[in-house]
């Protein structure tokens, strides 16, 4: 059962797994919940009638029966992890905390002339897992405007105490907000010859790397695959790290892969969602129980429901017996990995998928596409809505991106002459224009947010946020695109699509099918040969054949160019201008998604 | 409710400066781009130049030598300055607000009557 | 700069009778965005100008339907199906597609 809310002056008694310190409860709630056994905590507040060294410890505790009996305690607050929710989960924490030192291992020392600063300082550095930063009111003089980067091995402080005139924080890696490389890359028969920091038992260099990306000190990884020839390390991944960031020594060993944490990739690839099954393969654990399955997909799903199993070993059933049914173990580990792997004995095993809403819904594989033709198929393109206008009469206005449960990404031009969000609904889920009844259900728009600097699509700035009245329930019909990461500017984007009911030459109609188009991205250099009177910013990405034939054109406009990169969807662009339409050597001009992920987060992580 | 006032001195003398000030009310001026829009007397409208929400300018280029357009947001204010007038600069001075976008100017003031005279 | 130029300078109109009025511009106005920014005032007399329509022919709430739009590229059409003595004024015509933005000369609607 999902519970949100802190028990205020009440301590679980008896379960502890570890102490961390946290700088809140409701951060302490969210640590439980990344930690692969926290069910329940109990944090210690600041409060005259506790010892000052108990002030803020998180105490992370597990319990076979998912509860503990209660105590009361002032200053005490308790709860439950957000594991046993179904909802979408992040370990995004912008908060800064006032007068809270919070100690780690100081290994950068800076000035900035702002917290924000030394915020942004710290997330964009590779070790920072927090900050402390000394105000211009700090007493002593040479401390003044002083910037700690600090990290520690378990990525939250060692101590937190009470300091006047010092602020903290965290990290925004988690938030997106980083502007370090996105390596996607695993180097085949590497070893990295690095500290270990880790170690854990993988059954691939995928589940590996991802494993990597949500250990707080892990930078890069090595692991040795079931064909290396040291038997005692098969199947290990090692999680390592050096003081620049980088792999000191890359070292040619055959059956190892090596590569990288995906920290600044992971709000636009699964980094928790290990969702593949793993064939005639046994993974080793404490047993949690044992039920009979029809199969292994039915496994995985026992061990996803049941809330303290972390992977899971099938057995399929011997011939006629059990009514055809296999046995399903339901298993867990200290730190959520199989003690032990072992092949040939002919178990399938896996990952519980609870893990999955920690990863952005985004990354949710849609189902197979058609190739070729320019019509689309139902549930293709399903961030893809159309935007209708009611005044004077009800028409399709521009195409949008669903990129939260609340926002619509569009352009700002398709705003022209729109005086109030009242006249406007976004259908999603739609294929044919001709779907849209007056019974059709749709989301009212409660405000539009363009960007300030819009002026004409020409000049660039051509994006708007549209912030719905309801939230959209995800469904294979209608979820979310993921904004391309950061980390990711020098990714080479080869299988693109523009999609929308707009006209299919200049002087047309809209159509009633979603129409959809591959179309090759043009470099911004190639793109501005073909626009002398303009000026091609790095903030337009521009698309199209040189002879022509296929583009997008009026109706299009706010829709998606959609890319796919390592089988995940990114919008990468948003349809804004062009010369004509299709015309030869005049590509398409699209707003650059990746230059505006910050204007996005700020607007749409608004309080 | 959304209202635009010009206000200023109806009287300007040829060479001196002409300086009006656009009061908004009902909205902040940030959010909306404020354009400047003349009218001589028994003639037809000339665009003069806009205040972008974000505080750029853009002038009308037959004006551009002449016209500054700024803006005051704790005031709620925009202001015109033409210099170097002439009696051809005699107009009525109306500013207006640009829609969610630019254009099209949805809200008006009631305008203001410059005389350009010694 | 772009030229809009609008026929008939004067337009005198029986009261329930139709009326048009044509702007014609030096270049095309149909931007590289997909609108088309021509929008049509109307100035009543010893008042400010009110818009009437955008993009050609889009209404702006609480304008009557008798005012509709038509027209592309550098031909623009104004049309009133059955013209009111409240519709009395000069109309001008105006883009915002290329800097600097212009208006028509106007057309002056009076009652016959």
């Known amino acids: 059962e999902c519970v949100t809310q802190l028990l205020k002056d009440t301590c679980f008694e008896g379960g502890d797994i570890t102490t961390v310190f946290t700088p809140s409860a409701k951060y302490c709630q969210v640590v439980c919940t990344y930690h692969p056994r926290c069910l329940l905590f109990t944090f210690t507040a600041e409060s005259p009638s506790e010892d000052p060294t108990r002030w803020f410890t998180c105490v992370l505790k597990d319990s076979v029966t998912e509860t503990l009996p209660r105590v009361n305690r002032t200053a005490a607050i308790s709860g439950y992890s957000f594991k046993q929710c179904s909802h979408q989960i992040s370990a995004c924490n912008k908060d800064i905390y006032v007068d809270l030192d919070m100690k780690g291992i100081n290994y950068n020392s800076s000035v900035a002339k702002s917290a924000q600063e030394c915020q942004e300082r710290c997330t964009d550095d590779v070790h920072c897992h927090f900050f402390t930063y000394a105000t211009r009111q700090f007493p002593s003089l040479e401390h003044r405007n002083i910037c700690l980067l600090k990290h520690t091995q378990t990525g939250t402080p060692t101590r937190i105490t009470k300091l006047d005139k010092v602020v903290s924080g965290f990290s925004l890696k988690s938030c997106a907000l980083s502007n370090l490389a996105c390596i996607r890359d695993i180097f085949p028969n590497t070893v990295f010859a690095d500290s270990n920091i880790d170690s854990v038992m993988a059954p691939d260099a995928f589940v590996c790397g991802r494993i990597c990306t949500h250990h707080p000190g892990c930078l890069f990884f090595t692991f040795f695959s079931q064909e290396w020839p040291k038997e005692s390390q098969r199947n290990l991944c090692l999680l390592k790290t050096s003081e620049s960031g980088l792999p000191s020594t890359r070292i040619k060993k055959s059956k190892a892969l090596s590569g990288f944490s995906l920290q600044s990739c992971r709000h636009s690839i699964p980094v928790f969602c290990h969702s593949s099954f793993y064939h005639d393969t046994d993974f080793l654990g404490e047993e949690l129980d044992i039920v009979a399955a029809k199969s292994h997909e039915a496994c995985q799903k026992l061990c996803t429901n049941a809330v303290r199993c972390q992977f899971f070993t099938y057995t399929p059933a011997q011939a006629s017996c059990n009514e055809g049914k296999g046995k399903c173990y339901l298993k867990l580990s200290s730190n959520g990995s199989p003690t032990k792997i072992l092949h040939g004995r002919g178990g399938i095993s896996g990952y519980t998928l609870r893990l999955c809403k920690m990863d952005n819904e985004c990354t949710t594989k849609i189902k197979p596409r058609i190739v070729g033709g320019t019509a689309s198929v139902r549930g293709e393109w399903p961030w893809q809505v159309t935007l209708h206008t009611t005044s004077p009469t009800q028409r399709h206005l521009c195409g949008g991106s669903i990129i939260g449960n609340q926002w619509i990404l569009t352009a700002a031009h398709c705003f022209y002459g729109v005086e109030s969000p009242k006249i406007l609904r976004v259908y999603s889920g739609i294929l044919n224009q001709s779907e849209i009844k007056e019974d059709t259900s749709f989301f009212g728009v409660q405000e539009i947010i363009i960007h300030d600097q819009y002026k004409m699509a020409e000049s660039g700035y051509d994006i708007a946020l549209l912030k719905l009245e309801t939230t959209v329930n995800y469904t294979d019909s209608q979820r979310p695109i993921c904004l391309p990461s950061k980390g990711d500017r020098n990714v080479i984007y080869t299988d693109c699509w523009v999609t929308g009911w707009g006209y299919r030459k200049l002087r047309d109609k809209i159509q009633n099918t979603l129409q959809k188009a591959k179309i090759p991205l043009v470099t911004n250099e190639e793109c501005q040969k073909r626009y002398r009177g303009h000026k091609i910013t790095h903030k337009m990405i521009c698309a199209g054949y040189r002879e022509g034939g296929k583009d997008a054109c009026k109706g299009d406009s706010g829709g998606p160019l959609s890319c796919k990169h390592n089988e995940v969807w990114h919008l990468v662009g948003i349809t804004s201008w062009g010369e004509g339409c299709a015309q030869r050597e005049r590509p398409g001009v699209y707003t650059n998604v990746v230059e505006y992920v910050d204007w996005i987060l700020e607007k749409t992580q608004a309080v | 409710q959304v209202q635009l006032q010009e206000s200023g001195p109806g009287l300007v003398k040829p060479s001196e400066t002409l300086s009006l000030t656009c009061t908004v009310s009902g909205y902040s001026i940030s959010t909306y781009h404020v354009h400047w829009v003349r009218q001589p007397p028994g003639k037809g409208l000339e665009w003069i130049g806009i205040?972008?929400?974000?505080?750029?300018?853009y002038y009308n280029p037959k004006l551009k030598s002449r016209v500054t357009i700024s803006v005051d947001t704790s005031k709620n204010q925009v202001s015109l300055k033409l210099s170097s007038v002439t009696a051809a600069d005699t107009a009525v001075y109306f500013c207006?607000?640009?829609?969610?976008?630019?254009?099209?100017?949805?809200?008006w003031g009631q305008g203001t009557l410059v005389t350009v005279s010694s | 700069d772009v030229v809009l130029t609008q026929t008939p300078l004067s337009l005198p109109v029986t009261p329930g009778e139709p009326a048009s009025i044509s702007c014609r511009s030096s270049?095309?106005?149909?931007?590289?965005?997909?609108?088309?920014?021509l929008e049509w005032y109307l100035q009543k007399p010893g008042q400010s100008p009110q818009v009437l329509l955008y993009g050609v022919s889009n209404r702006l709430s609480g304008v009557p339907d008798r005012f509709s739009g038509s027209g592309s590229g550098t031909d623009f059409t104004l049309k009133i199906s059955r013209v009111e003595a409240e519709d009395v004024g000069v109309y001008y015509c105006?883009?915002?597609?290329?800097?600097?933005?212009?208006f028509g000369q106007g057309t002056k609607l009076e009652i016959k």
């Open positions: 105006f883009q915002a597609t290329h800097g600097p933005f212009t």
């Open positions: 270049q095309s106005l149909e931007s590289r965005d997909g609108n088309t920014y």
């Open positions: 205040m972008w929400r974000d505080g750029d300018t």
């Open positions: 207006a607000r640009g829609g969610t976008l630019t254009t099209p100017f949805t809200y």
